[in-house]
Structure formats: structure tokens, C-alpha cells
């Protein structure tokens, strides 16, 4: 069952998926000037059995300059508005991902892949939040969100993370100040599969992270 909405936004925070539940779809998107190969897959799908999960289908891009007899179905900007976008992910993975049953690892990048990845999450998916660089966790309760099915509708749980600029807070004497987290940027949440139209999307990788991070920032 696909989740109706995107994971919730947290100001000055980013979320990441450590692994993707079976049933998750990743759109095959190509960067500007490229398109999916003729009769290429529209998406990759996380599938598997009790012992192993992997991504079905392969995304392949070819130069738009190459004329094909069959018209390629490249999403137009208007169509993109109906989809959820995430920034290009790092192929580096935490070691424990492979041991999570019923989940796929982050798919490796494909040649001429678009800078944004468009995922379609399923019920049971969990994402993890952290404050972006320059902000720190004033309060870190459960800093994750899970897509759950209740009363026939899907709903993401609310992460209890409050990120604040260094100068905005004070602490009790003796309290240790948490460190600012690596850079990352939060995701848009305006419809179930939505593009990030009203704020800038930037690509970056946090060297200290061993997993993919979503990188859409509220400027």
C-alpha cells in the first residue's frame, strides 16, 4: 500500500531512509538532455522474498539527441508537480542495511541519472531526521517518522525533533551542548507525490554520513 503523503517536514531538518521497504518505487528519471531508453523501465521496484530483497528493473538513460522511432515518455514539468522529489542519493550505505529483511538498499546511481530521485513510499517505511548544518537539536525525542495505516488511511507519525540556531538557546549549567549535525535539507510536504517548486534544490553529500540524505532546504 502506497503512502498517500510525503513524510512530515521539520524546520531546519532533513530526513533520510536507511533502507526501502519492498513495494517502494523509484522513478527512472534522466538528467536534462537525456531520456529513458526506448521501452526502458518507468521505475525500479523493490521486490524480494523472505531472504533477499532487490530492485527489479534497471533505469537507463540515453541522449535526447539520439532520435528514436518510438517517442520517449519523459515527464514534463507539469507532470513533475504531481510527484515527490528527493535529491540524488549517495551510494554509500550503512552496514546494517543489508541485514534488514524485506528492505532494499539505496539503488546505485545509473548513468545520466537526474539529480533528484522520486520515491513512492509504502506503509511501514521509516525515515530518520537530523538538523541541518548550522542548527542543532534543541529537543530530540523520537526523530523518525513511520508511514502507518489507520482507519483505512495512511499517515506519517510526527517526529519530535526541534532544530534551532546556536544563538537561540540556553542550557542548564553543566549541560553539554549537542553538536550541529551534518548538512542536509528537509523535504516538501504539499501533496502525496510532490515536487519542490517553491524552494531551491541543491546537491551535496555529507562525507560523515554513510547513507543517503534528502537535500531540499527551506531558504
Amino acid at each position: 500500500e502506497l503512502c498517500d503523503d510525503d513524510p512530515p517536514e521539520i524546520p531546519h531538518a532533513t530526513f533520510k531512509a536507511m533502507a526501502y521497504k519492498e513495494g517502494t518505487m523509484l522513478n527512472c528519471e534522466c538528467k536534462r538532455g537525456f531520456r529513458r531508453i526506448k521501452s526502458g523501465s518507468l521505475y525500479m521496484l523493490c521486490t524480494g522474498n523472505s531472504s533477499h530483497s532487490s530492485w527489479d528493473n534497471q533505469c537507463q538513460c540515453t541522449s535526447s539527441a539520439t532520435r528514436n522511432t518510438t517517442k520517449q515518455v519523459t515527464p514534463q514539468p507539469e507532470e513533475q508537480k504531481e510527484r515527490k522529489t528527493t535529491e540524488m542519493q549517495s551510494p554509500m550505505q550503512p552496514v546494517d542495511q543489508a541485514s534488514l529483511p524485506g528492505h532494499c538498499r539505496e539503488p546505485p546511481p545509473w548513468e545520466n541519472e537526474a539529480t533528484e530521485r522520486i520515491y513512492h513510499f509504502v506503509v511501514g517505511q521509516m525515515v530518520y531526521y537530523q538538523c541541518v548544518q548550522g542548527y542543532r537539536a534543541l529537543h530530540r525525542g523520537p526523530a523518525e517518522s513511520v508511514c502507518k495505516m489507520t482507519h483505512g488511511k495512511t499517515r506519517w507519525t510526527q517526529p519530535q525533533l526541534i532544530c534551532t540556531g546556536e544563538m537561540e538557546t540556553s542550557q542548564f549549567p553543566g549541560e553539554e551542548k549537542p553538536q550541529a549535525s551534518p548538512e542536509g535539507r528537509p523535504e516538501s510536504e504539499t501533496s502525496c507525490l510532490v515536487t519542490t517548486t517553491d524552494f531551491q534544490i541543491q546537491t551535496e553529500m555529507a562525507a560523515t554520513m554513510e547513507t543517503s540524505i534528502f537535500t531540499t532546504e527551506y531558504q
Partner: antibody, heavy 115, light 107 residues
Framework: QVQLQQSGAELVRPGVSVKISCKGS????????MHWVKQSHAKSLEWIGV????????SYNQKFKGKATMTVDKSSSTAYMELARLTSEDSAIYYC????????WGQGTSLTVSS | DIQMTQTPASLSASVGETVTITCRAS??????LEWFQQKQGKSPQLLVY???TLAEGVPSRFSVSGSGTQFSLKINSLQPEDFGSYYC?????????FGGGTKLEIK
């Protein structure tokens, strides 16, 4: 079920301080930050500040710095707010509310400052 | 500080009618907005969080729209229990601020 139980109404003289409490129950207290909100006839609802129930870290609305001091006692699952140097302007109802989205509120503590 | 401007400040309506309350932020707050309902002598109660998600137990006659700087709360087919005050509030950066409120009264 989730409950935030606040201390009772206070009638105090100008110039003194008062400390009001908010006890959380029915959930893991340290999972949710605690906010304090002032409601007066003149100003509707005003956010005073927030305290991490886990670390004691605090952040205040600039307007209430020096006026309000928020603390927390994890062992009793209670958040406190002390209001100093009280004047008639501080007469209001004060609420505690939990979490990122203020999903549960205390019943309010009425504070009257009068000579 | 981000200013939240609510309109109208008050309105009268009859049971069964539809009303809309709007909230405007002085700058982009994305979807970091909550709506609260407060009945006379009671605490505020969360109605909507993150601009578009109805809180647990909130009837479907309540609907919301907007993101960025313009938001609205619509109540279809007003019920007697819907009368009271409504507030919007942002949680995009400190200090959080509330709208001035909208008092919904029975006509």
C-alpha cells in the same frame, strides 16, 4: 491517555515571583518538548518558550527573556515555569502544551497580579 | 518575528452553513502551520498540523488548504460544537507566533 495537569490558580502581589507546574502523564514525558503559552485578553495567545524535557535545553521568545524561566524535573515528569517581578501585565492564563505540533494542552493556570 | 494575520476577527453563522477562516504569514512558512480550536473557558485543542493534516478525531467537515504565506480553514455544515475561537500558529523558527484569533458565533 495523554494528560497535562497544571497547578492551580494564583493570586499574587506585584513584584513577587510565582512558579507554575505542568505534570505529564499517559506518555513518555521525555519524548516531547514542552511549550508555554500566555493567553490574555489584550494579546490573544503568545508563545513564551520551549524546554527540552530530555536535556533541559531552553529557547525563549525574546519578549519573555528575564520574565520567564523554564525548568524540568524528569523524575516527576513535570515542567515548571517561574515568572518574576510580576506586574498587572502578567495577569493571564498560562498553558503548557507538548510536542512539535502542540498536540495536547494543559487545562491552564490563571494568574492574577493585584495589590 | 513572523506575523500571523487572521481574518475575519469574528463572524456569525448558523448551524449548517459553511465558513472559511484565513491566515496570512508575513513571510514564507512553507507548511509549518497549525490550527487550534478553543471553546469558552477551555484550553485550545489541535485541529490541524503541518498545514494539511487533520488531528486525530477531527471530523471531515473541517478542511484546510494553503502553503507558503496563505492558509485557510473551512468548516462545512457547521455543527453546534464548532462555535468558539480559532487560532493559527506557525512553528517555522523561533519565536512561534499565533494569529489574533477568529471568534465564530452562532447567528
Amino acid at each position: 491517555q495523554v494528560q497535562l495537569q497544571q497547578s492551580g490558580a494564583e493570586l499574587v502581589r506585584p513584584g513577587v515571583s510565582v512558579k507554575i507546574s505542568c505534570k505529564g502523564s499517559g506518555y513518555t514525558f521525555t519524548d516531547y518538548a514542552m511549550h508555554w503559552v500566555k493567553q490574555s485578553h489584550a494579546k490573544s495567545l503568545e508563545w513564551i518558550g520551549v524546554i527540552s524535557t530530555y536535556s533541559g535545553d531552553v529557547s525563549y521568545n525574546q519578549k519573555f527573556k528575564g520574565k520567564a524561566t523554564m525548568t524540568v524535573d524528569k523524575s516527576s515528569s513535570t515542567a515548571y515555569m517561574e515568572l518574576a517581578r510580576l506586574t498587572s501585565e502578567d495577569s493571564a492564563i498560562y498553558y503548557c502544551a507538548r510536542g512539535v505540533t502542540f498536540d495536547s494542552w494543559g487545562q491552564g493556570t490563571s494568574l492574577t497580579v493585584s495589590s | 518575528d513572523i506575523q500571523m494575520t487572521q481574518t475575519p476577527a469574528s463572524l456569525s453563522a448558523s448551524v449548517g452553513e459553511t465558513v472559511t477562516i484565513t491566515c496570512r504569514a508575513s513571510e514564507n512558512i512553507y507548511s509549518f502551520l497549525e490550527w487550534f480550536q478553543q471553546k469558552q473557558g477551555k484550553s485550545p485543542q489541535l485541529l490541524v498540523y503541518n498545514a494539511k493534516t487533520l488531528a486525530e478525531g477531527v471530523p471531515s467537515r473541517f478542511s484546510v488548504s494553503g502553503s507558503g504565506t496563505q492558509f485557510s480553514l473551512k468548516i462545512n455544515s457547521l455543527q453546534p460544537e464548532d462555535f468558539g475561537s480559532y487560532y493559527c500558529q506557525h512553528h517555522y523558527g523561533i519565536p512561534y507566533t499565533f494569529g489574533g484569533g477568529t471568534k465564530l458565533e452562532i447567528k
